[in-house]
């Protein structure tokens, strides 16, 4: 990482006494079963904990659950099981917490076999009180809140009915039958697929895609021959079966399904899949599976309409539909993504992009690390990051990579240093510049979390033995202090801190075991007295993101602009605080060819910034489908990268003409759509 401000580790003064005064133990009066924890609202301090325990009897399983509530970030808990009439709560539905700070919670109860419908418990006051409601259906899925209005809920029933409530679950109405999948879109719109003949599975590829914008009063069929659909950013995607064979193609809409365009992506066969890896309002990362059981595919990045795609990364590791991919959005720095590729020799290597998929490179070898046994050359190797795939393979990796938008530049991950990911026990590495440079932070696997917007990093060693020690760093992982939080070690099960990394509280969850019983226990540690003063201006330094060469005029330019951030100095031990807002200053860069992606019919040869015509399209008119009409494209091969803000400099010419012809290849052209009202 960037040269540290302090080579020597200064100890935080009197931290043991300060932390001891701020360590709160809570022993749960339960037998150990499963425990789930949810935060209710932002900065409210309200946590709900649901413990469940199954007792197998001779012919049935008897379940028991308890509900606890804290309103001080987990320091104290109150048993509120009586608020839900001591009912057994179904953990597979989890606790459905309302969006933003609505304070809404829905718990789905277990009901006896013969009942007419399910039962839910609803709270709209941050779980202070609950109302029991019997449902006219048995839910198949968790209640889904409309992102725009937390009073609007939707759920699918076990009979494939689509049910909607407009008054936060008080009253329910079945708005459609034979529904396979339903999702909220923007503006309280619901998208869903329906089957006509037998079932969702039988009709796969012959489903219809419907839309309602008025909670079921009226409907519009916006697609036919649908295999599946997905929403990402402002894009609606549908994979549609081809007329002639069993292949399917992606179609995309940016107007809620009124008009569709065929995405310039390869079609896929029965055994293959598409996957939206990431999407925002500018663009989408799409994975297209390779034919055969290869375990890899290709990442494509879209233009601003989601139609023209550029090949971004070959041999991208993605095991099966709904399987594992290591694709990770590094949220602490704009434009950065990390993923894994499966190389020809079947080893797995980590790749990183700093420009939203434009270029991928290996991760730079940490300065304080040696190349491991996987390296052919002991002086030349890279850092390889363990993510979802390693976790799924049961490697000794307790956590995926971690980054937080308000902890600018910080990325923490397990990794190994060599030519490929190693199955050996990994260490924990940190980057303070969004992935450009890395340092070994902790030896061996750990759980880790970020507090106070990066002001504190907390870690606990991953061990099969009981633990009683927590580690913390106030200088972005350079130096570590250890604190013994209990005399009696516990079997550790998880670290919990409020989402958003603004809190200064961390909860350590685990269980204690004695001769006959085991009990859940939590220790909540408040670090407020370690960071005893509020940060002042002198505690911050300015940092230019994406800086690789200070002498280069375009240093820091990514997607057409550079950003300078105020960041906490590593040597400052102070509180950013809950109200901390990232201070950044953008400045526009001149356009270069790097700010353009290759247009339809063009590609970039390796290590070249120029776009050249695809040989098979040379001399042909460039015609493609847009909104069900054929368009003629006049281009010199470039299209501005979505989200790129550059101005001046290079400016390639581009013109699109409407050929006033219908596309025969577009199955979702507007005249195939119809509307109806309830």
């Amino acid at each position: 990482s960037a040269p540290g401000e302090d080579e020597e580790c200064g100890r935080v003064r009197d931290f043991v006494a300060k932390l001891a005064n701020n360590t709160h133990q809570h022993v749960f009066d339960d037998l150990r079963g499963s425990v789930s924890l949810s935060w209710v609202g932002d900065s409210t301090g309200v946590i709900l904990v649901l413990t469940t325990f199954h007792v197998p009897l001779v012919i049935m399983t008897f379940g028991q659950s308890k509900l606890y509530r804290s309103e001080d970030y987990g320091k104290n808990f109150k048993d509120i099981t009586d608020l839900i009439n001591n009912t057994f709560i179904r953990t597979e539905f989890g606790m459905a917490i309302g969006p933003e700070n609505s304070g809404k919670v829905v718990l789905t109860a277990e009901v006896s076999g013969g009942s007419r419908g399910g039962r839910i418990f609803r709270s709209s006051d941050f779980a202070k009180n609950f109302v029991q409601t019997d449902l006219p259906f048995h839910p198949l899925t968790q209640m889904m809140y409309s992102p725009q209005n937390s009073d609007y809920l939707l759920a699918l029933s076990t009979e494939n009915g689509l049910w909607v409530s407009k008054n936060f679950g008080g009253k329910w109405e079945e708005i459609h039958k034979a529904v396979c999948l339903a999702k909220w879109g923007s503006d309280n719109t619901i998208f869903f697929t329906t089957y006509a003949n037998g079932s969702c599975k039988a009709d796969l590829g012959a489903l219809e895609l419907w839309r309602t914008s008025d909670l079921g009063k009226s409907f519009k069929t916006i697609g036919v021959k649908i295999y599946s659909f997905g929403l990402g950013g402002r894009f609606l995607f549908a994979s549609v079966m081809a007329d002639k064979d069993t292949t399917r193609r992606i179609h995309v809409s940016t107007d809620q399904g009124d008009t569709w365009s065929m995405a310039q992506l390869p079609s896929v066969g029965q055994e293959q899949f598409y996957s939206i890896l990431a999407a925002n309002d500018d663009m989408v990362f799409m994975h297209v599976d390779e034919p055969g059981d290869t375990g890899f595919g290709t990442i494509f990045t879209s233009d601003d309409r989601g139609i023209v795609y550029s090949k971004s990364l070959d041999r991208h590791l993605y095991t099966t539909t709904g399987g594992e991919t290591d694709f990770t959005n590094v949220t602490s720095l704009r434009g950065v993504y990390i993923t894994s590729v499966l190389s020809e020799d079947n080893s797995i290597q980590t790749m990183i992009t700093f420009d939203q998929g434009g270029r991928w490179t290996h991760l730079r070898k940490p300065e304080n690390s040696e190349c491991d046994a996987t390296a052919k050359n002991k002086n030349e190797c890279s850092l390889h990051i363990h993510a979802s795939y390693s976790i799924s393979q049961k490697l000794n990796v307790p956590m995926a990579p971690l980054s937080e938008p308000n902890a600018v530049g910080i990325v923490i991950a397990h990794g190994s240093v060599g030519d490929a990911i190693s199955v050996m026990v990994p260490d924990v590495y940190i980057s303070d510049d969004g992935g450009y440079s890395w340092t070994k932070m902790l030896e061996g696997p750990h759980y880790y979390t970020i507090l106070d917007s990066g002001g504190i990093i907390v870690a606990i060693e991953h061990s099969s033995r009981p633990i009683n020690v927590i580690k913390f760093s106030t200088d972005e992982g350079q130096c570590w202090q250890t604190y013994t939080f209990t005399r009696d070690p516990i079997y550790f099960t998880g670290l919990a801190s409020e989402p958003g990394a603004r809190s200064m509280n961390i909860s350590i969850w685990g269980f204690t075991e004695s001769f006959l019983t085991s009990q859940w226990v939590s220790y909540t540690i408040d670090f407020k007295d370690i960071l005893e003063r509020n940060c002042e201006e002198k505690d911050y330094t300015i940092w230019l993101a994406h800086s690789t060469d200070p002498e280069d005029y375009e240093d820091g330019c990514i997607l057409g602009y550079k950003e300078q951030f105020l960041r906490l100095r590593k040597s400052s031990v102070c509180q950013n605080g809950r109200d901390y807002v990232v201070t950044k200053q953008p400045s526009i860069c001149l356009c270069s060819l790097e700010d353009f992606l290759c247009d339809f019919g063009y590609y970039r040869p390796e290590n070249d910034s120029k776009c050249v015509e695809q040989p098979e399209l040379k001399g042909h008119d460039l015609e493609f489908c847009l909104y069900g009409r054929e368009e003629h494209l006049t281009t010199n091969g470039y299209r501005k990268i979505p989200g790129d803000k550059c101005q001046g400099g290079v400016n390639p010419v581009r013109e699109v003409k409407d050929l006033k012809k219908k596309c025969t290849s577009n199955f979702l052209s507007p005249e195939k759509q119809n509307s109806k009202s309830n």
Epitope: A2, P3, E5, D6, E7, D433, K538, T541, I542, W543, L544, A545, H546, S547, P550, E551, D552, Y553, D555, G556, K562, Q564, R567, S571, Q585, S587
Partner: antibody, heavy 124, light 106 residues
Framework: QVQLVQSGAEVKKPGSSVKVSCKAS????????ISWVRQAPGQGLEWMGG????????NYAQKFQGRVTITADESTSTAYMELSSLRSEDTAVYYC?????????????????WGQGTTVTVSS | DIQMTQSPSTLSASVGDRVTITCRAS??????LAWYQQKPGKAPKLLIY???SLESGVPSRFSGSGSGTEFTLTISSLQPDDFATYYC????????FGGGTKVEIK
């Protein structure tokens, strides 16, 4: 190689203001910090304040707070230092200097490029 | 603001001598210290940054050491071109300079 070229010598009356410019040529401007340092005749160096042009926010020494304004114009790669309410003890050579940078951080790596200096004389 | 005290204020030495200049900070500044050389009528020239890192192009006879509050600049073998005034400067927060040390011919 970067060069910092400062405006010419100034003679000012007490109570008036002076504005000294510092133009960068031959390298980047917006992503380096620029400091202003003065040196009275026969005296040592005194830091007045600094700015990172791309960031826009200036930082001033306590002694000059309220009397000095440091600005930067990225389009012309020029930094400015304006000192108001001049008095005779402000007679000095005023230097602009670029703060070195090895990484994205503006950690302190010393002032590696200096202007030639601008003599400001305050006399009635 | 942090005060920087440089000693001695004047130092007489001969060519070939080993010269040491000391700088003391009123509070810890970690390693945020730079050393400059200035000749009459000229702008200062950076010699050392971050207490001990030699700026490129500066002869290796110059070296810096120290951290916290005590720092030294050493010229291992004084050359005719080295007769000048030397300043230390801290940058932990706001920048302040030491009073200077004039190295003159004995």
């Amino acid at each position: 190689q970067v060069q910092l070229v400062q405006s010419g010598a100034e003679v000012k009356k007490p109570g008036s203001s002076v504005k000294v410019s510092c133009k960068a040529s031959g390298g980047t401007f917006s992503s380096y910090a620029i400091s202003w340092v003065r040196q009275a005749p026969g005296q040592g160096l005194e830091w007045m304040g600094g700015i990172i042009p791309g960031f826009g926010r200036a930082n001033y020494a306590q002694k000059f707070q309220g009397r000095v304004t440091i600005t930067a114009d990225e389009s012309t790669s020029t930094a400015y230092m304006e000192l108001s309410s001049l008095r005779s003890e402000d007679t000095a050579v005023y230097y602009c200097a670029r703060q070195g940078r090895k990484t994205g951080y503006y950690y302190y790596y010393g002032m590696d490029v200096w202007g030639q200096g601008t003599t400001v004389t305050v006399s009635s | 603001d942090i005060q920087m005290t440089q000693s001695p204020s004047t130092l007489s030495a001969s060519v070939g001598d080993r010269v040491t200049i000391t700088c003391r900070a009123s509070q810890s500044i970690s390693s945020w210290l730079a050393w400059y050389q200035q000749k009459p009528g000229k702008a200062p020239k950076l010699l050392i940054y971050k207490a001990s890192s030699l700026e490129s192009g500066v002869p290796s006879r110059f070296s810096g050491s120290g951290s916290g509050t005590e720092f030294t600049l050493t010229i291992s073998s004084l050359q005719p071109d080295d007769f000048a005034t030397y300043y230390c400067q801290q940058a932990d927060g706001h920048i302040t300079f030491g009073g200077g040390t004039k190295v003159e011919i004995k």
